[in-house]
Interface confidence: low
């Protein structure tokens, strides 16, 4: 037989108030060991007159057939208690002398043997006739996982001999499995909740539970699925799930009802240039939904208010857009608007941004080239050209003159300032084709360069030049 | 009921630029945000690109040197464009309602050979 | 570069319970990935399951359900059929771009 218990504490050998299976002498006391998997027997007491370990008359395959079955003694079959209590059970058998070859009892779970810090112990009873083999396992504070099938194998004549299973079932409080998700929903629209509790025990309700009072006025099985008809404010929703055990609460989730985004906020100018600025925000609170883009909005500060608002749109990541196209030295108002699928958020407040100035947009006009031979120098004159308020200041001019001869190349450029409209430049190779161009500059770069002009400096005196191909309208003059 | 047909030829040839169309029925561009995807034969499903309500857009990363997608409100259509066309990009291209993958249209298969 | 995994297959018994995931390389799914579930048979165009985690689109029955498990995105066909038998593919929404799922092929036994 066997026997399984909840203890508090006791000691392994007065674990068994009734008598031992098998045939155990009143003065007898057993020899222990602790389990390992494959335990050997204890050595023989004296006045044996066949220990069990010991060798003994040959035996015939015919004659092996005939030695009496040997098996595991009937022990309980079904073990339930709760969470957290300590069990014992165990397994015998009883040896006869006949059986030469023995091997020590393992324990199994669910068909994997249970190897290293399981708590087990076996115990050794011999008498004259053979040994009695008990195999104690304990489990302290059982767990769910401790849940399932336990039994006990050992070899006997290289037979292998299995116990009958020992289940042991853990009951304990409602386990959950699936609880019921955060969502976001939109407004007065259905949408679904699940939850799953588990035992044992069996069967496991569940009460739904919005902003803290219950949703159904019966249980329902679990698993269980609410169907909420929609929300226009926001709620919390949990389940209990109860079982014979008592009561477990799943966590509160919040289910969130989906608006417009909030504006976005702290609007900056991250770089001005001419005709572009770079703009960034923080986008609002989402509204519980993802923002999907985002509407740049841009009006002429300067203009009366009927000004017209340029709109730029933009994926919703990452927070900055470059407005491009703007007219250079100008003040413009920028504000920025979010979406998501519920619709646009306001404008953030309007901030101020100002375009720098621009380079010059024409070429300086009426260029002339004039070689003079006395001083070896090309004499070059222009007309400033028209510059306008939002191409900057004019702060001077480029020239570039390159020379060209058979075999020769040379590129240079000068800059001059702003006072006057000619300059002067040394005569860098004779016999060789000079072509001069102009650019004016401002603070806000180089503008375009002047038609080229082109002048042939002779070996000797004698001189040709192309006049500007840029005279202002009604100018002819020649040199 | 909201449907989707997708339009654009069933041959190109490397290096071309595919064009491809989806119109919309029974419901507003202005209100509904179009995604394109892709499915090569025996493969898995491949976003390309989104158009949203307002007129913006979002690409795949890998892709979006070769994409282009927009929109005609007042024609209900959705256009995709890609260029530099490549026998990999063989595959059956569909569009579908944006946020809820659940209206599909039929795809139409490209093949792209010489 | 984002990758979603699916279960590359699953089998189910007729009027069984199948549960396919959806994990994203990322980290955990959240309600902000809009998962969305898309059943394909062969040669037909894909068909809307869920979005938005745990909507269900028109006319979908609902054996049909979607949630986040754990980490994951999951969707649960109960009572399965014969003609469940399809490839379903998921999609995770990051920001601003879909990336789907290389999909699950689910076969249907007997």
């Known amino acids: 037989g066997g026997t399984a218990e909840k203890w508090e504490e006791t000691e392994l050998d007065q674990l068994f108030s009734g008598p031992l299976p098998g045939r155990l002498p009143v003065n007898h006391r057993p020899f222990s060991a602790p389990h390992s998997s494959r335990d050997q027997l204890p050595p023989p007491q004296t006045g044996r007159s066949h220990p069990a370990h010991t060798a003994a008359p040959q035996v015939t395959s015919t004659a092996s057939k005939l030695l009496p079955p040997v098996a595991f003694n009937h022990t309980i079959g079904h073990i339930v208690l709760s969470e957290h209590k300590n069990v014992k059970f165990n397994c015998s058998i009883n040896i006869p002398n006949t059986y030469q070859e023995t091997a020590g009892i393992s324990w199994w779970k669910d068909g994997k043997e249970l190897l290293g810090a399981h708590h087990s112990i076996t115990q050794f009873y011999p008498d004259e006739e053979g040994v009695s083999i008990i195999a104690l396992f304990s489990i302290a504070s059982v767990q769910r996982s401790d849940n399932g099938s336990y039994f006990c194998k050992m070899k006997v004549n290289n037979r292998e001999i299995v116990s009958d299973p020992i289940y042991v079932e853990v009951q304990g409080l409602p386990y959950f499995i699936k609880q019921p998700e955060s969502v976001n929903v939109t407004r007065n629209t259905a949408f679904n909740l699940t939850c799953q509790a588990v035992g044992p025990p069996e069967p496991v309700n569940i009460f739904w539970v919005q902003n803290s009072s219950r949703v159904n006025e019966k249980p329902e099985r679990s698993p269980s699925v609410l169907t909420v008809p929609g929300l226009t404010e926001t709620a919390v929703f949990s389940c209990e799930a109860h079982n014979d055990k008592g009561l477990t609460v799943s966590k509160g989730v919040h289910i969130n009802i989906k608006v417009i985004p909030s504006p976005p906020t702290e609007v900056h100018i991250l770089n001005s240039t001419a005709h572009s600025i770079l703009v960034s925000w923080v986008p609002g609170f989402d509204g519980y939904s993802p923002l999907q883009n985002c509407s740049i909005q841009v009006k002429e500060a300067d203009r009366l208010s009927n000004g017209s608002v340029m709109v730029f749109n933009t994926s919703a990541s990452p927070h900055l857009y470059e407005i491009q196209q703007l007219q250079a030295l100008a003040n413009y108002s920028i504000a920025v608007s979010c979406r998501n699928e519920i619709g646009w958020s306001a404008v953030s407040p309007w901030i101020l941004a100002s375009t720098t100035e621009g380079a010059p947009s024409v070429a300086p006009l009426n260029i002339t080239v004039f070689l003079n031979e006395s001083n070896n120098i090309l004499d070059i004159r222009w007309t400033k050209p028209p510059i306008k308020r939002q191409d900057g200041e004019l702060v001077g001019y480029r020239i570039s003159h390159v020379w060209e001869s058979a075999g020769t190349y040379k590129e240079l450029s000068e800059e001059v300032s702003q006072n006057g409209s000619w300059a002067q430049i040394p005569v860098q190779i004779h016999n060789a084709t000079c072509t001069v161009r102009i650019a004016a500059i401002t603070k806000g770069g180089i503008g375009p360069f002047s038609e080229p002009v082109n002048i042939i400096i002779p070996e000797h005196s004698k001189v040709d030049y192309a006049p500007s191909s840029t005279p202002a309208p009604g100018n002819t003059d020649s040199m | 009921q909201v449907t989707l047909k997708e339009s654009g030829p069933v041959l190109v040839k490397p290096t071309e630029t595919l064009t491809l169309t989806c119109t919309v029925s029974g419901i507003s561009l202005s209100s509904f945000a179009i995604s394109w995807i892709r499915q090569p034969p025996g493969k898995a499903l491949e976003w390309l690109a989104v158009i949203w309500t307002g007129g913006g857009t979002d690409y795949n990363s890998a892709l979006k040197s070769r994409l282009t997608i927009s929109k005609d409100t007042s024609k209900s259509q959705v256009v995709l464009t890609m260029t530099n066309m490549d026998p990999v990009d063989t595959a059956t291209y569909y569009c579908?309602?944006?946020?809820?993958?659940?209206?599909w249209g039929q795809g139409t298969t490209v093949t792209v050979s010489s | 570069q984002t990758v979603v995994t699916q279960e590359p297959s699953f089998s189910v018994s007729p009027g069984g319970t199948v549960t396919l995931t959806c994990r994203s390389s990322t980290g955990a799914v959240s309600t902000s990935n809009y998962a969305n579930w898309v059943q394909q048979t062969p040669g037909q165009a894909p068909r809307g399951l869920i979005g938005g985690a745990n909507s269900r689109a028109p006319g979908i029955p609902d054996r049909f359900s979607g949630s986040i498990l754990g980490n994951k995105a999951a969707l649960t066909i109960t009572g399965a059929q014969a003609d469940d038998e399809s490839d379903y593919y998921c999609?995770?929404?990051?920001?601003?771009?879909?990336?789907f799922g290389g999909g699950t092929k689910l076969t249907v036994l007997g």
């Open positions: 579908a309602s944006h946020w809820y993958l659940d209206v």
């Open positions: 999609a995770l929404w990051f920001s601003n771009h879909w990336v």
